[in-house]
Interface confidence: low
């Protein structure tokens, strides 16, 4: 009678994350009695995953009936496979011994890959914020994807950015990898809107690719600018001084107001105008009362931007560009009249 | 029905020791049997099986340092290449099925000291 | 791989009160969770299997319960000699398993 084959038809398979995976073996002959065990890889260290005489194999079942006497199929259906099952089985008939069985035959074994979806990417941007002009770095992981194959992109508002450095880890053979790609980002004072995007495509995500996004209206800081101008008001020997804040971005700003280089007020912005580009404009104003000044006034509108070191711009009023009241027994107004801004 | 463990001793390191499991009132060709170990002050660590056919399973750690096998009264654990890491007590244990599934006689304990 | 972890890693009990202790695995395990108690210098005892069933001889103050992935322990009517190590251990697969036990809770009884 010709020698029992261990028949392992399927050299290998590949099987989704959560799914189950069903073994083929078969044999040739009910010679010589023995059990059947199963094992994952070959060698010493080769891992029990079924035995048909004993054991308990929760994950594991039978595909044919093993009771009946004339049974020759051996395959086994594992179930809920996670990337941790891969490797290659091996069908090993035994032959009955005493007081251990020994190994007689073995099939050519089958490899399992298991394909897992790659997790949702995150990225994540500088820590500090930074001006427009300025090249800045995003960074995107995703992790627990098999096979290792996946292509990565990086987009800036749907154009796609080549500046970029991708690695998958780890480089050797493993259950499951992951990814990490550094993108170096030019900012531009139109950024407070915009978006960074990094796309993972992969086998398990049947063309429908992952995404995660950064704003850049977190990273990005737009500098102010400033405008000092004066309009004569309708009062005599007052004049209306303001400071246009322009184009800033984040909100947070605070705006000092110094007469010959001493302050004289300190507001917060409130009340902001926002512009179609995400940055924002906001205006103080000071009346200025020249009938109490003898000599030229200079007025410093100084600006404190997100923590930032302060900018400034300075108007000379010229006090002899106004008529002076002439024996007034009254005594002079308070030279700066605080007002709320506009 | 009992089993207990013999051949801890204090070892230099890298010198291989094999650990004893005799039992008695029963059959390793009905149980599995289990070796598991317990450094000073810590838990219970899992280390592999035998089954009644001889086949044998490993923790994850304990893969290439450690080897069991059997006759048909006595149930070995091999400590290849021992570190300091290895000093514990170790337990040889029966399981309560012909598998793999709980522990429900134990040995008292044999300890191995890998010391300089 | 399946991972178990207990809580907490020690508790304090008087004499006539209850202990809870709780075991949780990373996987879904259905009842395959055994409970030991281990005494200083002595070896482990099985207490509970299959998540609820007392082992022989043991004492029903013990009590297992869950199913799943949360399993719970609950001694209750303390008693001084129940001062010990509990270890809670899945016995659902070994396949690919770095622990097969939980890192134990110490029951201190005053």
């Known amino acids: 009678e010709e020698e029992l084959q261990v028949i392992q038809p399927d050299k290998s398979i590949s099987v989704a994350a959560g799914e189950s995976a069903t073994l083929h073996c078969t044999v040739t002959s009910l010679i010589p009695v023995g059990p059947i065990q199963w094992f994952r890889g070959a060698g010493p260290g080769r891992e029990l995953i079924y035995n048909q005489k004993e054991g308990h194999f929760p994950r594991v079942t039978t595909v044919s009936d093993l009771t009946k006497r004339n049974n020759m199929d051996f395959s086994i259906r594992i179930s809920n496979i996670t990337p941790a099952d891969a490797g290659t089985y091996y069908c090993v008939k035994f032959r009955k011994g005493s007081p251990d069985h020994v190994e007689f035959k073995s099939g050519a074994g089958t490899e399992l890959s298991v394909r897992a979806k790659p997790s949702a990417p995150v990225v994540s941007g500088p820590a500090a914020r930074a001006t427009p002009q300025h090249t800045v770095s995003f960074t995107c992981e995703s992790h627990g994807f098999s096979p290792r194959d996946i292509t990565l992109k990086w987009f800036k508002n749907g154009n796609e950015l080549s500046d970029f450095q991708t690695n998958v880890d780890p480089a050797g053979d493993s259950v499951s990898y992951s990814i990490h790609s550094t993108a170096k980002v030019v900012l531009t004072r139109e950024d407070v809107h915009s978006q960074v995007i990094c796309e993972v495509a992969h086998v398990t995500l049947q063309g429908d690719p992952l995404r995660g996004t950064a704003n850049l209206s977190e990273t990005i800081r737009v500098p102010p600018t400033l405008e000092v101008t004066q309009q004569p008001v309708r009062a005599e020997n007052q004049v209306n001084v303001t400071c246009q804040v322009r184009k800033f971005y984040p909100q947070r700003l605070q705006l000092t107001w110094l007469e010959n280089g001493n302050v004289s007020r300190t507001e917060t912005a409130s009340t902001l105008t926002e512009n179609k580009d995400g940055t924002y404009n906001w205006m103080s104003w000071l009346l200025v009362n020249v009938s109490a000044h003898r000599d030229d006034v200079k007025l410093t509108c100084q600006v404190e931007h997100d923590g930032q070191p302060a900018v400034s711009k300075s108007h000379d009023l010229k006090v002899s560009a106004h008529p002076k009241e002439q024996g007034s027994n009254t005594a002079p107004g308070p030279a700066l009249a605080s007002a709320a801004p506009l | 029905q009992s089993v207990e463990e013999s051949g801890g001793r204090l070892v230099t390191p890298g010198t291989p020791l094999t650990l004893t499991c005799t039992v008695s009132?029963?059959?390793?060709?009905?149980?599995?049997m289990h070796w598991v170990r317990q450094a000073p002050g810590k838990g219970l660590e899992w280390i592999g099986i035998i089954y009644t056919g001889g086949a044998t399973s490993y923790a994850t750690w304990a893969k290439g340092q450690f080897t069991i096998s059997k006759t048909s009264t006595t149930v070995d654990l091999k400590i290849t290449s021992p570190t300091t890491e290895d000093t514990a007590t170790y337990f040889c244990?029966?399981?309560?099925?012909?598998?793999?599934?709980?522990?429900?006689?134990w040995g008292p304990g044999t300890l191995v000291t890998v010391s300089l | 791989q399946i991972v178990m972890t207990q809580t907490p890693f020690s508790v304090s009990a008087v004499v006539g009160g209850t202990v809870t202790i709780k075991c949780q695995a990373s996987h879904n395990i259905g009842s395959w969770l055994a409970w030991y108690q281990q005494k200083p210098g002595q070896r482990p005892k099985l207490l509970i299997y299959d998540a609820s069933t007392l082992a022989s001889g043991v004492s029903s103050r013990f009590k297992g319960s869950g199913s799943g992935t949360e399993f719970t322990l609950t001694i209750s009517g303390v008693e001084s000699a129940d001062a010990a190590t509990y270890y809670c251990q899945q016995g659902y697969g070994i396949s690919y398993v770095h622990n097969v036990f939980g890192g134990g809770t110490e029951v201190v009884v005053k």
């Open positions: 009132g029963f059959s390793l060709s009905n149980y599995a």
């Open positions: 244990a029966r399981g309560d099925r012909d598998g793999y599934a709980y522990f429900n006689i």
